[in-house]
């Protein structure tokens, strides 16, 4: 039962995270939550950083600045892969949840 519940939580978190990405950066509240998660957990996107390419408001050459290894304003623009966190947040935060919840 515990495993089923954990999988359900992970699935919900994944869906919710991707939903919030769709609103980035239009919704300031959403943006600040996602930015905080990405910066704190050193992750980028749901599965990985390429998820941001699919977001209409984000150009192909851009990720949120919170994905950068060294976060500064604009660092997500024209990024190179070595300058950003490539791991996805769902797996990274999920791992933390599994350990701590």
């Amino acid at each position: 039962a515990g495993y089923v519940f954990r999988d359900k939580v992970m699935s919900e978190f994944n869906n919710n995270f991707r939903q919030q990405m769709e609103n980035y950066p239009k919704n300031n509240h959403t943006a600040s939550i996602l930015d905080r998660m990405q910066a704190d957990f050193k992750c980028c996107g749901a599965a990985n950083y390429t998820d941001w390419e699919k977001i209409p408001s984000m150009s192909k050459n851009r990720v949120p600045d919170s994905c950068c290894i060294n976060v500064t304003v604009g660092c997500g623009i024209n990024f190179n892969e070595k300058a950003i966190h490539k791991e996805g947040c769902v797996e990274k935060i999920g791992g933390w949840l599994r350990k701590n919840v």
Epitope: G74, G76, I77, N80, K82, A83
Partner: antibody, heavy 120, light 113 residues
Amino acid sequence: QVQLQESGPELVKPGASVKMSCKASGYTFTTYVIHWVKQKPGQGLEWIGYFDPNNDGTKYNERFKGKATLTSDRSSSTAYMELSSLTSEDSAVYYCARSRTYYDASMDYWGQGTSVTVSS
Amino acid sequence: DIWMTQSPSSLAVSPGEKVTMNCKSSQSVLYSSNQKNFLAWYQQKPGQSPKLLIYWASTRESGVPDRFTGSGGSGTDFTLTISNIQTEDLAVYYCQQIFSSYTFGGGTKLELK
């Protein structure tokens, strides 16, 4: 003072490769990104790609993926660009230029350019 | 991709005149996080490398005379104004967006009347 010294002109045969250099001086090499820009005779400027000496990261214009390879040698503060499978379309002047970062990418210092002529 | 369109392609001027050239981007280059337009202007004289004049659409590079002024806050429409034109200003002027990859406009050539 800041200088970007590029290698001399190249006359190469179609199908061959060429590697040009850009030696930086007057600043800390790893704190600036090196961009490469193409200019065909009598035409405008076209961005090829950048090399970030801080993390060896690269970014290419889609049009130049597979054509250009960007590298550097930190010990000599030199950036390199290799162009492969050359055709007459690659005949141009190639500039290296630096920018503070890849995102604040206004290019404040430029090399003098390397002229590449592809001819049999 | 973001495309940059410059107009006019050439301008005939006399010394002392004031000229304005335009640069239009196909998408906004305004970054909401810092409210800066990621656009630069360059000057290229015959046989020389390009020289940076303006960055962030309106900030003059150090050493550039204040006769050169960049403006445009819409995110898509930008202008470079040169007042009291000198003969040494005869050159090709390029705008460049830095917001999504890097693309240059086709240039505006400043010639003597």
